[in-house]
């Protein structure tokens, strides 16, 4: 049996229904069997877990996703073995295997792989700060969302009106969410906002920086 699946990965927003397309061509016999299984990201195919079987004219959802899986066409004997997965969770991200068996059609292995990513908006990020906050010193502002798929990008902005910082005194890394402030001055003091963004949305946190004279302690 030759199985056809999309070559590009599938992305589905959190809570929506994913349709994992799988089609095939074979003269369906009574021994026809379909199995859908799931592998977590980074795990080998050998560690797949069955989530649905079809055999002897009957459908058998199985495992932790059993209440949320069904077939687009039941019975899946018309050449369409597409899986529907409702109310997708972040833990549904991974590789799905569509395997069709139909003896004596052994021309190919009857296996198709689909990568599913569940799209999750960024969670409210945590803003933190470390380093010397005295005049002339350097500090790092950090921002990180515990959730978000694809991984959010981070952008720091300073709120309010303030003099333009000298070039190179503010360097940010959109991937790590870190903002490095060097050669601090009293005018560096203020509120900084980090916005975490992906295709599903954005979330933000704020942090107030107080730059002090070298003789004084650090106040955050």
């Amino acid at each position: 049996v030759e199985v056809k699946v999309p070559t590009e990965p599938l992305s589905t927003p959190l809570g929506k229904t994913a349709e994992l397309t799988c089609t095939y061509s074979t003269s369906v016999g009574d021994s026809f069997a379909l199995e859908w299984s799931f592998v977590q990201p980074g795990k080998p195919i050998s560690e797949s877990h069955p989530i649905l079987y079809f055999t002897n004219g009957h459908l058998y959802p199985t495992g932790s996703k059993s209440k949320r899986v069904s077939l687009l066409q039941n019975p899946p004997t018309v050449g369409v073995a597409t899986l529907k997965l409702t109310d997708v969770h972040p833990s549904d991200t991974g590789t799905y295997l569509c395997q069709v068996n139909n003896p004596p059609d052994f021309y190919t292995n009857g296996l198709g792989l689909i990568n599913l990513t569940v799209l999750v908006p960024p969670s409210n990020p945590l803003c933190s700060q470390s380093g010397q906050t005295s005049v002339g010193g350097s500090t790092a502002l950090r921002c990180s969302s515990s959730e978000g798929a694809p991984k959010p990008v981070y952008n720091w902005v300073r709120l309010g009106t303030f003099p333009t910082p000298s070039p190179g005194s503010m360097v940010q890394d959109e991937v790590s969410g870190q903002l490095i402030l060097t050669n601090l001055s009293l005018t560096s003091s203020g509120t900084y906002r980090c916005v975490a963004t992906n295709q599903m949305g954005s979330a933000s946190c704020e942090l107030t920086l107080s730059v002090t004279e070298p003789s004084q302690g650090r106040v955050a």
Partner: antibody, heavy 118, light 107 residues
Framework: QVQLVESGGGLVKPGGSLRLSCAAS????????MSWIRQAPGKGLEWVSS????????HYPDSVKGRFTISRDNAKNSLYLQMNSLRAEDTAVYYC???????????WGQGTLVTVSS | DIQMTQSPSTLSASVGDRVTITCRAS??????LAWYQQKPGKAPKLLIY???TLPEGVPSRFSGSGSGTEFTLTISSLQPDDFATYYC?????????FGQGTKVEIK
């Protein structure tokens, strides 16, 4: 050699019923998917039903679904098509055909003519 | 449903001619295409399946090519026995459908 011989065609009134048969020989019938395909006079070919090797799975196009029933008797090497609620547009030569491992049709019978007319 | 469209509907040719018939599918059918030859009053005969595979006994002057949505049947040197009607059929997902046919007649 493979032989498929259809029978049971004839003249029937609209709304009537007819049962076609196909006698198979020369191959292992019980291992083969089978189909019925029809051809209206002067027209092209239309697949009308299929059945799996042991009869568990049957399929139909929308044009005949609910009116036609395909069945088989592997002990008798026979394929059947029960046609109910016949319409004028069902008038055609009906062929029985064996399916390959993929659903193309590698052997055909000579056909039997069904005429639906008042 | 997948629609199959053949062109031309009729083709006039002479013995020895190279003949090409085209079949288009309304959506991707990969290589799941068969070709049949039918003579008047006779049942169709399988010529090609999987777009390009010839069953045993089919003369090598017949060849098939294509994948996706566009396919061709070629007769490299037309013989007297080849004047007939030719049909394509997809063997992908149900319902399996045929093209409307191409009649190859003597010029």
């Amino acid at each position: 050699q493979v032989q498929l011989v259809e029978s049971g065609g004839g003249l029937v009134k609209p709304g009537g019923s007819l049962r076609l048969s196909c006698a198979a020989s020369g191959f292992t019938f019980s291992n083969s998917g089978m189909s019925w395909i029809r051809q209206a006079p002067g027209k092209g070919l239309e697949w009308v039903s299929s059945i799996s090797d042991g009869g568990l799975y049957t399929h139909y196009p929308d044009s005949v679904k609910g009116r036609f029933t395909i069945s088989r008797d592997n002990a008798k090497n026979s394929l059947y098509l029960q046609m109910n609620s016949l319409r004028a547009e069902d008038t055609a030569v009906y062929y029985c055909a064996r399916q390959g491992v993929r659903p193309f049709f590698d052997y055909w019978g000579q056909g039997t003519l069904v005429t639906v007319s008042s | 449903d997948i629609q199959m469209t053949q062109s031309p509907s009729t083709l006039s040719a002479s013995v020895g001619d190279r003949v090409t018939i085209t079949c288009r599918a309304s959506e991707n059918i990969y290589s799941y295409l068969a070709w049949y030859q039918q003579k008047p009053g006779k049942a169709p005969k399988l010529l090609i399946y999987n777009a390009e595979t010839l069953p045993e006994g089919v003369p090598s002057r017949f060849s098939g090519s294509g994948s996706g949505t566009e396919f061709t049947l070629t007769i490299s040197s037309l013989q007297p026995d080849d004047f007939a009607t030719y049909y394509c059929q997809h063997h992908y997902v149900i319902p399996w459908t045929f093209g409307q046919g191409t009649k190859v007649e003597i010029k």
